[in-house]
């Protein structure tokens, strides 16, 4: 799939997206994959990490507007830190204001992504499908 | 966004996707865009054509498995031909068996795509959101 040294002329309005792992979704130079098999949050995180990715991080409603249309519930990389009562991402960054509406359906320290930028709190040990994400440089 | 003549080394497991119109979703070298504004089927078709694309064509559950997760209902390029009673795509090809479950909610000659490969029959003049698709060469 290498594009190097190809003499292909593409319109200026068209562009390549990526690079992404093979058969992942590429959107605005981020890579996403939805995994069907249900795993708990820790296993989901491990699965993403094994693919050089992380669980979904929501950082921009504009750059990630494709997430509006996602059906069902999927683990994302948002975790609750009980000691200070904060929701933060795997990378340690704090959840930015106005990005997600957190809904406490269950008591838990992990969150499921649901359409229209909602986060449902869930027990981290419950199996769910998950979304991995890889940000391109 | 041109990648030509760049000496970038990417893993063999990684690849670029496209080319696609700027800010479209790229998946398995097809380009998709979801449009929020509601239009009737004919206006939706015209909108896609103006962007050198067509309304969504479902041709493979494997290559288009991202469509499983799509929330809501959106115009696709499937139309009913009253003379012979068949459903066919804009390009004239016949709807392959076992690809879509056609559900007759309304009387009509156009179809809305809904998650899990369902097609809902609808009156073509009703406004709905729509999905454009561009197949890369």
């Amino acid at each position: 799939n290498s594009l190097f040294n190809q003499e292909v002329q593409i319109p200026l309005t068209e562009s390549y997206c990526g690079p992404c792992p093979k058969n992942w979704i590429c959107y605005k130079n981020n890579c996403y994959q939805f995994f069907n098999e249900s795993k708990n949050w820790y296993e989901s995180q491990a699965s993403c990490m094994s693919q050089n990715a992380s669980l979904l991080k929501v950082y921009s409603k504009e750059d990630q507007d494709l997430l509006k249309l996602v059906k069902s519930y999927h683990w994302m990389g948002l975790v609750h830190i009980p000691t200070n009562g904060s929701w933060q991402w795997e990378d340690g960054s704090i959840l930015s204001p106005n990005l997600l509406t957190i809904i406490e359906m269950q008591k838990g320290d992990c969150a499921l992504y649901a359409s229209s930028f909602k986060g449902y709190i869930e027990n981290c040990s419950i199996p769910n499908t998950y979304i991995c994400m890889q940000r391109t440089v | 966004n041109s990648l030509f003549n760049q000496e970038v080394q990417i893993p063999l497991t990684e690849s670029y996707c496209g080319p696609c119109p700027k800010n479209w979703i790229c998946y398995k070298n097809n380009c998709y865009q979801f449009f929020n504004e509601s239009k009737n089927w004919y206006e939706s078709q015209a909108s896609c054509m103006s962007q050198n694309a067509s309304l969504l064509k479902v041709y493979s559950k494997e290559d288009q498995d991202l469509l499983k997760l799509v929330k809501s209902y959106h115009w696709m390029g499937l139309v009913h031909i009253p003379t012979n009673g068949s459903w066919q795509w804009e390009d004239g090809s016949i709807l392959s068996p076992n690809l879509l479950t056609i559900i007759e909610m309304q009387k009509g000659d156009c179809a809305l795509y809904a998650s899990s490969f369902k097609g809902y029959i609808e009156n073509c003049s009703i406004p709905n959101t729509y999905i454009c698709m561009q197949r890369t060469v």
Partner: antibody
């Protein structure tokens, strides 16, 4: 240095309204959950309402639900409490408090000095 | 709603004494418990959070323990400035609730 400064308290008749403000400084206001806590004269502490802009949630004690509204203006780093249909039992010192994180589960890390609301005819 | 019951409600002790205040929750609250000190006419001050974590700047003579439903605040050696009212508070679920308070006075 984190500072919380309440204002807007005073004497009001039963059934009346009052709007409390809490001006803040010394931290990124929009990143933190904020609450109002009150203390009736000679009594203990009672949580009134919570708001998190970051997490997009708001909650109220049953005793004030439907009468009080919490809001914030992130551009002014200010928290508000609109109090309507006031009753004698709402008489208290009202404290503005900052949670340690962006959710109600964090402790009250900092408190203002309080503003006294007296509901009496 | 989760009720918090502090005991004792009133405590008389001397400088240098070791003092323990308990807080019992009506249901399990994991470690979502904080302790506050309040002096007359002043706002409360956070001492302990997450049941046992000492807030920055709080003297080490204060300590907290417990998990689930039973919690304790211990002052290892009372100092004159420690005479105040102490409250426990849970943030496991809303409504956030406080204990009724423990008034610590000089004997």
């Amino acid at each position: 240095e984190v500072q919380l400064l309440e204002s807007g308290g005073g004497l009001v008749q039963p059934g009346g309204s009052l709007r409390l403000s809490c001006a803040t400084s010394g931290f990124t206001f929009s990143d933190y959950a904020m609450s109002w806590v009150r203390q009736a004269p000679g009594k203990g502490l009672e949580w009134v309402s919570y708001n998190s802009f970051s997490v997009g949630s708001t909650d109220y004690a049953d005793s004030v639900k439907g009468r009080f509204t919490i809001s914030r203006d992130n551009s002014k780093n200010t928290l508000y409490l609109q109090m309507n249909s006031l009753r004698a039992e709402d008489t208290a010192v009202y404290y503005c408090s900052k949670h340690s994180g962006n959710y109600y589960t964090g402790p009250f890390h900092y408190w203002g000095q309080g503003t006294l609301v007296t509901v009496s005819s | 709603d989760i009720q918090l019951t502090q005991s004792p409600s009133f405590l008389s002790a001397s400088v240098g004494d070791r003092v323990t205040i308990t807080c019992r929750a009506s249901q399990g609250i994991s470690s979502y418990l904080a302790w506050y000190q309040q002096k007359p006419g002043k706002a409360p001050k956070l001492l302990i959070y997450a049941a046992s974590s000492l807030e920055s700047g709080v003297p080490s003579r204060f300590s907290g323990s417990g998990s689930g439903t039973d919690f304790t605040l211990t002052i290892s050696s009372l100092q004159p400035e420690d005479f105040a009212t102490y409250y426990c508070q849970q943030s496991y679920s809303t409504p956030i609730t406080f204990g009724q308070g423990t008034r610590l006075e000089i004997k």
